[in-house]
């Protein structure tokens, strides 16, 4: 039975040209995290494998940095980066947990972080 929950940074906004940290946290389970995948729609951004370390997709290599922790730092933001991002936790023995973050990249300097929220 899957008992875990994923807490994410929720709905967030950032300025064009700036950077943002995408962060998820898995709690309420003793399952072992074997891998975390970061995706934007059907595009892979990065994978953090517990044994093998980080793999950043070649499409994002110049502006995605691993961390902090299992999170991901997105740099040199453009308006096209606006959209949904997903953290997919592969765990044993529970299976897969998915968290969602919505990022809005703004032209102006009024960007501010949204509230944290949980996905069961």
């Amino acid at each position: 039975m899957m008992t875990g929950t994923i807490e994410t940074t929720g709905n967030i906004s950032a300025e064009k040209g700036g950077s943002i940290i995408l962060q998820c946290h898995l709690s309420s389970t003793t399952a072992q995290v074997t891998q975390v995948n970061w995706e934007q729609q059907d595009q892979l951004l990065a994978i953090c494998n517990a044994d093998l370390g980080w793999h950043i997709s070649p499409s994002f290599k110049d502006r995605v940095a691993p961390g902090p922790g299992l999170g991901l730092t997105l740099q040199s933001l453009t308006v096209n980066d606006t959209g949904e991002y997903f953290c997919i936790y592969h765990t044993y023995p529970d299976g897969t947990y998915t968290g969602r973050i919505f990022l809005e990249v703004l032209e102006s300097s009024v960007a501010e972080h949204g509230a944290r929220f949980q996905i069961p």
Partner: antibody, heavy 120, light 107 residues
């Protein structure tokens, strides 16, 4: 140029342990990760598992109870042991190298393969 | 495990003509797909990784595309040296799994 060379007995009796070694030349095993893959006659490639640069191992759950992958960095080689073999373990066995950081799970240097037949 | 299904099973192509091989994953695998060519009597060799990136030294007549569950390997103009069995592989999650292969031969 990196070369991988599999070696081991071509014939193994049922219920015995299959033992193969992959010798790596032209590159140090202290980075990247090192895989075993097999291909039974007329069937698809099957992933067996890996040993990482740090010595951590992953085994395909379908074989996990019977598989051990180890390494000897002083000899720059890694090994596969598969216990309690049956005719279904008859296959061409390949060792291969992966660079997770750059290529994820894509394996880009392969040995030539060694045929193992399980028969009494 | 994620099941990878390739079509067609075999393909007979006239030299200089294009060829296309499809690979479908049983669940979304983003862009974590590699393509290999196993020439007769040889071990598999990496052609494409991350769905669309050619590995070092691979001729530009090979191209990969797709994301999610559906992927395609295209050869723009088939040459005699392209014969063999082509495999797709996913590395979205462990265990890594392969397609059943597509045999390409020259007419």
């Amino acid at each position: 140029e990196v070369q991988l060379q599999e070696s081991g007995p071509g014939l193994v009796k049922p219920s015995e342990t299959l033992s193969l070694t992959c010798a790596v030349s032209g590159y140090s095993m202290t980075s990247d990760y090192w895989n075993w893959i097999r291909q039974p006659p007329g069937k698809k490639l099957e992933y067996i598992g890996y040993i990482s640069y740090s010595g951590r191992t992953y085994y395909n759950p379908s074989l996990k109870s019977r598989v051990t992958i180890s390494r000897d960095t002083s000899k720059n080689q890694f090994s596969l042991k598969l216990s309690s073999v049956t005719a279904a373990d008859t296959a061409v066995y390949y060792c291969a190298r992966g660079d997770y950081s750059n290529y994820g799970g894509a394996m880009y240097d392969w040995g030539q393969g060694t045929t193992v037949t399980v028969s009494s | 495990d994620i099941v990878m299904t390739q079509t067609p099973l075999s393909l007979s192509v006239t030299p200089g003509q294009p060829a296309s091989i499809s690979c479908r994953a049983s669940q979304g695998v983003s862009t974590t797909i590699a393509w290999y060519l196993q020439k007769p009597g040889q071990s598999p060799q990496l052609l494409i990784y991350s769905a669309s990136y050619r590995y070092t030294g691979v001729p530009d007549r090979f191209s990969g595309s797709g994301s999610g569950t559906d992927f395609t390997l295209k050869i723009s103009r088939v040459e005699a040296e392209d014969v063999g069995v082509y495999y797709c592989q996913q590395y979205y999650s462990s265990p890594f799994t392969f397609g059943g292969g597509t045999k390409v031969e020259i007419k």
